[in-house]
Interface confidence: low
């Protein structure tokens, strides 16, 4: 079998809301993936599991099931949304994200995604990790690739 390529493209949009009493930030982050099937048979994207980390803490998880079928030598772009919550021990971020004196309230999030594909009963998992900028101070839509954060040292495996 040939490879199935998964490319994390970036954050497509981030929609933010706040709970003033709880000093909590809710961020709905929509990400984009390109999945390429280099095989001569169709492949089912069975599920996508994703999680978002801020400061080494998981702040959101999502799972999509029975997503699509990708034809032979074909590519599909898939969007998935991860609801995230910045609260409790990270409630100090509420002040930063709601500060009016600055225009852009970028925070660095680590996006982790695992795509499970199946063909004729055989499962394959492909994982990706990327650091991305997300503005926690307003609703934002991004040009694909615009939110990538390149200057972060990747933690050693």
């Amino acid at each position: 079998p040939r490879s199935i390529d998964v490319k994390y493209i970036g954050v497509k949009s981030a929609y933010v809301s706040y709970d003033v009493q709880k000093r909590t930030i809710y961020l709905n982050i929509t990400n984009t993936l390109n999945i390429t099937n280099n095989n001569y048979y169709s492949v089912e994207v069975e599920n996508i599991t994703a999680q978002v980390q801020f400061s080494k803490t998981v702040i959101g998880k999502a799972r999509l099931n029975n997503i699509t079928i990708i034809g032979p030598l074909d590519m599909k772009q898939i969007d998935y949304t991860v609801p995230t919550v910045i609260a409790e021990e990270m409630s100090y971020m509420y002040d930063f994200c709601t500060l009016i004196s600055i225009k852009v309230h970028n925070i660095v999030l680590m996006m982790q995604v695992t795509v499970t594909t199946t063909y004729f009963g055989h499962s394959e998992q492909i994982s990706q990790e990327r650091y991305q900028y997300v503005d926690c101070g307003r609703n934002t839509t991004y040009q694909l690739g615009q939110s990538e954060y390149l200057n972060v040292l990747q933690p050693q495996q």
Epitope: Y40, S42, E44, E46, G71, P72, D74, F120, H122
Partner: antibody, heavy 121, light 112 residues
């Protein structure tokens, strides 16, 4: 209900070509590939090849390259097989089939009704 | 091409009997992904074939549990316990592990 409805019987002369059809209904035509299988009278089954209607990619059994040409029309959810330079060896029932229910596990779980092609002068 | 050899060619049975059909492949049909794509089909007179068993031993949806498949490597068996009238027809094995995919020659299950 998922169905593959094939065109009617064909009587053709040696050396001629014939194009038979397989109309899909009850599912998204572009997402599942369609195979073609040959069955000569009183004989077994032979896999000819497949087409993936979503992008027109085809894959043939070497034995049928140059003999069979597979195409698909997504607007009418119909797959076609053209057989060229016909001889008596091409007289057979031709089936289209699809792995609709068992996409992850098996090859042909939905079969067409079959089209009889008779080559005779 | 992988040659699939079925025995017997004809299998006369009485209703209620057990039946066993053998299928032998000319080489191992374990796919590179570790699965064995051996399937069994039944073709009744004047009808299209129908899937019974996939991946050696898995019954397809709606197939009665009197049908069972077994085997590995190059030797495979389809067993029918308590044959019923609706089981009569020609049984084909099929391998989908190596292109071109190939069928066995068929075994005709008929009344004694």
């Amino acid at each position: 209900q998922v169905q593959l409805q094939q065109s009617g019987p064909e009587l053709v002369k040696p050396g001629a070509s014939v194009k038979i059809s397989c109309k899909a209904s009850g599912y998204r035509f572009t997402s599942y590939y369609i195979h073609w299988v040959k069955q000569r009278p009183g004989q077994g089954l032979e896999w000819i090849g497949w087409i993936y209607p979503g992008n027109g990619i085809t894959n043939y059994n070497e034995k049928f390259k140059g003999k069979a040409t597979l195409t698909a029309d997504t607007s009418s959810s119909t797959a076609y097989m053209q057989l060229s330079s016909l001889t008596s060896e091409d007289s057979a029932v031709y089936y289209c089939a699809s792995p609709y229910y068992g996409i992850r596990n098996c090859y042909f779980d939905v079969w067409g009704t079959g089209t009889t092609v008779t080559v005779s002068s | 091409d992988v040659l699939m050899t079925q025995t017997p060619l004809s299998l006369p049975v009485s209703l209620g009997d057990h039946a066993s059909i053998s299928c032998r492949s000319g080489q191992s049909i374990v796919h590179s992904n570790g699965n064995t794509y051996l399937e069994w089909y039944l073709q009744k007179p004047g009808q299209s074939p129908k899937l019974l068993i996939y991946k050696v031993s898995n019954r397809f949806s709606g197939v009665p549990d009197r049908f069972s498949g077994s085997g590995s490597g190059t030797d495979f068996t389809l067993k029918i316990s308590r044959v019923e009238a609706e089981d009569l027809g020609i049984y084909y094995c099929f391998q989908g592990s190596h292109v071109p995919w190939t069928f066995g020659g068929g075994t005709k299950l008929e009344i004694k």
